[in-house]
Amino acid sequence: NFMYSKTVKRLSKLREYQQYHPSLTCVMEGKDIEDWSCCPTPWTSFQSSCYFISTGMQSWTKSQKNCSVMGADLVVINTREEQDFIIQNLKRNSSYFLGLSDPGGRRHWQWVDQTPYNENVTFWHSGEPNNLDERCAIINFRSSEEWGWNDIHCHVPQKSICKMKKIYI
């Protein structure tokens, strides 16, 4: 029976994934009962990705390691729509690391997952980035401009945002 074997496979995957993310929230995609897309609970989902707001304060490097241990990366923002979704879950009085850094301090910004940096899809606050020694990017709220990016020192602890592809079971 096709449905039975599909369910057995799904349960097997859930058991395999349970040691990394004990609880998954899944939805059926489209009309096909075969396709379930999941995010760990309590991550949020948008399009094909899952997002986690980490409220622990860590350096940029430690924040990225924390994400990668969970099978994710610091967030790579690809569109205005994605940023608009993300900011719904952020607190205005906090700053959050993005997966964007300039390791050499030469204004060669690079995303942690090697997505090409596209100057046309960036959301820097006006006047930012403004310091060659500030080599990591955060997203924060400024009353004059709402949400945008700022360059800061990488060792200064911040909250962070992790992003991973949805889990398909």
Partner: nanobody, 127 residues
Framework: QVQLQESGGGLVQAGDSLRLSCAAS????????MGWFRQAPGKEREFVAA????????NYRDSVKGRFTISRDNDLNAGYLQMNNLKPEDTAVYYC????????????????????WGQGTQVTVSS
């Protein structure tokens, strides 16, 4: 905690071959994408090759394409880097790294995407 151990390095002549191995502890190796990176003296650690958790997808840095082949054996909890036609510029310490992933097809190229690293094995290619 995942632990990794590389082996297979050594001193060879230009044009020779080596096969590096990476042994992983634990029984969940198949949940991890694997990458090989290298670091020459005084240089940044750089991406060499990566393979998805299923083994179906691979990525290579341009300078090793056609010479190096990455593979894995999930039953043996091991990964490999077959290096042919070695050149003096391949001289470096080679590291294997693992990254948890729920995608069977992604082969990650960013060194910061890998939280688990081995101690490295030295490869020296003389001319």
């Amino acid at each position: 905690q995942v632990q990794l151990q590389e082996s297979g390095g050594g001193l060879v002549q230009a044009g020779d071959s080596l096969r590096l191995s990476c042994a992983a502890s634990g029984n969940t190796f198949s949940m991890y994408a694997m990458g090989w990176f290298r670091q020459a003296p005084g240089k940044e650690r750089e991406f060499v090759a990566a393979i998805s958790r299923s083994g179906g997808s691979t990525n290579y840095r341009d300078s090793v394409k056609g010479r190096f082949t990455i593979s894995r054996d999930n039953d043996l909890n091991a990964g490999y880097l077959q290096m042919n036609n070695l050149k003096p510029e391949d001289t470096a310490v080679y590291y294997c790294a693992l990254r948890l992933t729920f995608s069977t097809t992604d082969a990650y190229t960013g060194k910061l995407q890998y939280p688990y690293w081995g101690q490295g094995t030295q490869v020296t290619v003389s001319s």
